[in-house]
C-alpha cells in the first residue's frame, strides 16, 4: 500500500506523458489524477514505465473503479493488463471484440495465462455463445484454444462458428471434445459437395459415428491412414472389409503398417480372416473360417 502524500509543487500531471517515468512511486500516486489516467490510458502503453510504476497506476484505477473497469479503459490497458489478476478481470464486462483482440495482443507469443483464460471466459459468457468472429480471433492467438474447452463449453459453439476452425485447432482435442464438435461440423458443411465436404469435415472425423463413416465410403474420398487412425475405435469396428476398402481407396495398403495399432488392430479382430485375405495385404488375426460369430447384443436383448 502506497502512503498518501501531497504532490510536490509543480509536479501535478496535466497529461500522461514520458515525463512521468522520472516520477517516484509515491509521486505517481500523489500527482497523477485517476480520472486523467482513465481518459488517457491509450498513452500508457507508449511510455516505458517500470513494473513498480505500473503497479501504482493499476492501484489508482482500482480506487477509481472498485466495481471493475469500464470497457473504454480496458481496451487501452496494454501492458497494464499483465498486472491484472483473475479476480480483477472477473469484475469486467467486456463486450467488444476489439477490446479482446487488444488484450490478447499484449499476451501474444506466451502460453495462455490464468488472466487470459478468465478474460476469454468473461467475454464468451457475455456473448452467450462462441460465435464465428470470436472463435476466429481466439484460435488465431491460441490454436489449441478449442481443445482447452470442456465438452459442456463446446456445446455452446454454434455450427456457423465451425467455419472458423482450422485443422491445427483440433490437434489436441480428445474424443469427447470431437464427439461434441463433429455433429456441428456436419451441420455446418452439409450443403457442400462430396470432395469439398470431406476436406472440411476430415479434421472432425474423430467424433464421427459408424453410419457416417459408411456413408463417406460412398463418396470416393480416399481417406488417408493418419485420419483413419484418429477415428473412434467403436465407430470403426462395425465397418466391413469392403467399406474400409472403399473408404481408404488406394490408401488401403497402409493398413498393413498399422495392423498392430488401434483402431486397425481391433478392427482386424472383428473381421473374418477370409474377408481380410481378399485385400491381399497379409493382414492376420481375423476370425478363422468356419467359426461362428455370435451377436452378443442380440443375446443380451433376449435374456
Amino acid at each position: 500500500e502506497v502512503e498518501k502524500t501531497a504532490c510536490p509543487s509543480g509536479k501535478k500531471a496535466r497529461e500522461i506523458d514520458e515525463s512521468l517515468i522520472f516520477y517516484k512511486k509515491w509521486e505517481l500516486e500523489a500527482c497523477v489524477d485517476a480520472a486523467l489516467l482513465a481518459t488517457q490510458m491509450d498513452r500508457v502503453n507508449a511510455i516505458p514505465f517500470t513494473y513498480e510504476q505500473l503497479d501504482v497506476l493499476k492501484h489508482k484505477l482500482d480506487e477509481l473503479y472498485p466495481q471493475g473497469y469500464p470497457e473504454s479503459v480496458i481496451q487501452h490497458l496494454g501492458y497494464l493488463f499483465l498486472k491484472m489478476s483473475p479476480e480483477d478481470i472477473r469484475k469486467w464486462n467486456v463486450t467488444s471484440l476489439e477490446t479482446l483482440k487488444a488484450l490478447l495482443e499484449v499476451n501474444k507469443g506466451h502460453e495462455m495465462s490464468p488472466q487470459v483464460a478468465t478474460l476469454i471466459d468473461r467475454f464468451v459468457k457475455g456473448r452467450g455463445q462462441l460465435d464465428k468472429d470470436t472463435l476466429d480471433t481466439l484460435t488465431a492467438f491460441y490454436p489449441g484454444y478449442l481443445c482447452s474447452l470442456s465438452p459442456e463449453e463446446l456445446s455452446s459453439v454454434p455450427p456457423s462458428s465451425i467455419w472458423a476452425v482450422r485443422p491445427q485447432d483440433l490437434d489436441t482435442c480428445d474424443p469427447r471434445q470431437l464427439d461434441v464438435l463433429y455433429p456441428k461440423a456436419r451441420l455446418a458443411f452439409q450443403n457442400m459437395n462430396g470432395s469439398e465436404y470431406f476436406v472440411k469435415i476430415q479434421s472432425f472425423l474423430g467424433g464421427a459415428p459408424t453410419e457416417d463413416l459408411k456413408a463417406l465410403s460412398q463418396q470416393n474420398v480416399s481417406m488417408d491412414l493418419a485420419t483413419f487412425m484418429k477415428l473412434r475405435t467403436d465407430a470403426v469396428l462395425p465397418l466391413t472389409v469392403a467399406e474400409v476398402q472403399k473408404l481408404l481407396g488406394p490408401h488401403v495398403e497402409g493398413l498393413k503398417a498399422e495392423e498392430r495399432h488401434r483402431p486397425v488392430r481391433d478392427w482386424i479382430l472383428r473381421q473374418r480372416q477370409d474377408d481380410l485375405d481378399t485385400l491381399g495385404l497379409g493382414l492376420q488375426g481375423g476370425i478363422p473360417n468356419g467359426y461362428l460369430v455370435l451377436d452378443l447384443s442380440m443375446q443380451e436383448a433376449l435374456s
Epitope: 453410419e211 459408411k214 465410403s217 460412398q218 470416393n220 469392403a242 474400409v244 476398402q245 472403399k246
Partner: antibody, heavy 117, light 95 residues
Framework: ELLLVESGGGLVKPGGSLKLSCAAS????????MSWVRQTPEKRLEWVAT????????YYPDSVKGRFTISKDNAKNNLYLQMSSLKSEDTAMYYC??????????WGQGTTLTVSS | ASLGDRVTISCRAS??????LNWYQQKPDGTVKLLIY???RLHSGVPSRFSASGSGTDYSLTISNLEQEDIATYFC?????????FGGGTKLEIK
C-alpha cells in the same frame, strides 16, 4: 441362413402409388446399407435406391429422385420402397439387396410392379 | 457355348472405375447371386472355375469348364461412383 423376401408388388395405374416391403433375416440388419434394384421387361438391371444402416442417408439415381423414398425399420428388420407418381417405365421386377461398400452381396427373389392403365 | 468349354465374357466401362467391378449371375428363374467383386475376388461359396480379371476400363469374367448349372445371364456392375450401373447382361446358352 441369410434371407431377403420382397412383397407388395402389383398392378398400378400411371400416376399412382405403391409401397414395396422386404423382410430381412439371418444377419444384423442394422449394420448394413440396403438397396433396391429393378429389372426391366428388357432384362436390364437398374439401381433404384440405397439407404444407410441407420437410415440417415439415402441415395437415388435421377430417374426416381423425388418420386421414390427408401426407408428401413431396424427394429422389424424391414426395408421399404414408397413409390409415387408412377410411370409405365417403372414397370419391372423389384429386388431387395444387401449392399456392402460397393457391391450387392445378397438378393431377394423379387416382386413385380406393373404400371399400366 | 458347349458344356466343358472355357467361356469368357467382357465388360467395358466408359471411364476408369479403379477395379470396382463386380459380376452377378442370374438364373432363368430370376435368382440373382454375386459371383465376383473388386475385379477378381470370389464371393463365398462360388466355385473356383469362375475367375475374373481386368483394370481401368476393361474387365472380363471366365468360366474355365462350363457346367449345366452355369447356364444363366451374367451382369457386370461398377461400384466406383454413384449412380451404380450395370452392364446389359450376357446370356449363356448351350449349343
Amino acid at each position: 441362413e441369410l434371407l431377403l423376401v420382397e412383397s407388395g408388388g402389383g398392378l398400378v395405374k400411371p400416376g399412382g402409388s405403391l409401397k414395396l416391403s422386404c423382410a430381412a433375416s439371418g444377419f444384423t440388419f442394422s449394420d448394413y446399407f440396403m438397396s433396391w434394384v429393378r429389372q426391366t421387361p428388357e432384362k436390364r438391371l437398374e439401381w433404384v435406391a440405397t439407404i444407410s444402416n441407420g437410415g440417415t442417408y439415402t441415395y437415388y439415381p435421377d430417374s426416381v429422385k423425388g418420386r421414390f423414398t427408401i426407408s428401413k425399420d431396424n427394429a422389424k428388420n424391414n426395408l421399404y420402397l414408397q413409390m409415387s407418381s408412377l410411370k409405365s417405365e417403372d414397370t419391372a421386377m423389384y429386388y431387395c439387396a444387401r449392399f456392402d461398400g460397393y457391391y450387392f452381396d445378397y438378393w431377394g427373389q423379387g416382386t413385380t410392379l406393373t404400371v399400366s392403365s | 457355348a458347349s458344356l466343358g468349354d472355357r467361356v469368357t465374357i467382357s465388360c467395358r466401362a466408359s471411364q476408369d472405375i479403379s477395379n470396382y467391378l463386380n459380376w452377378y449371375q442370374q438364373k432363368p428363374d430370376g435368382t440373382v447371386k454375386l459371383l465376383i467383386y473388386y475385379t477378381s475376388r470370389l464371393h463365398s461359396g462360388v466355385p473356383s472355375r469362375f475367375s475374373a480379371s481386368g483394370s481401368g476400363t476393361d474387365y472380363s469374367l471366365t468360366i474355365s469348364n462350363l457346367e449345366q448349372e452355369d447356364i444363366a445371364t451374367y451382369f457386370c456392375q461398377q461400384g466406383n461412383t454413384l449412380p451404380y450401373t450395370f452392364g446389359g447382361g450376357t446370356k449363356l446358352e448351350i449349343k
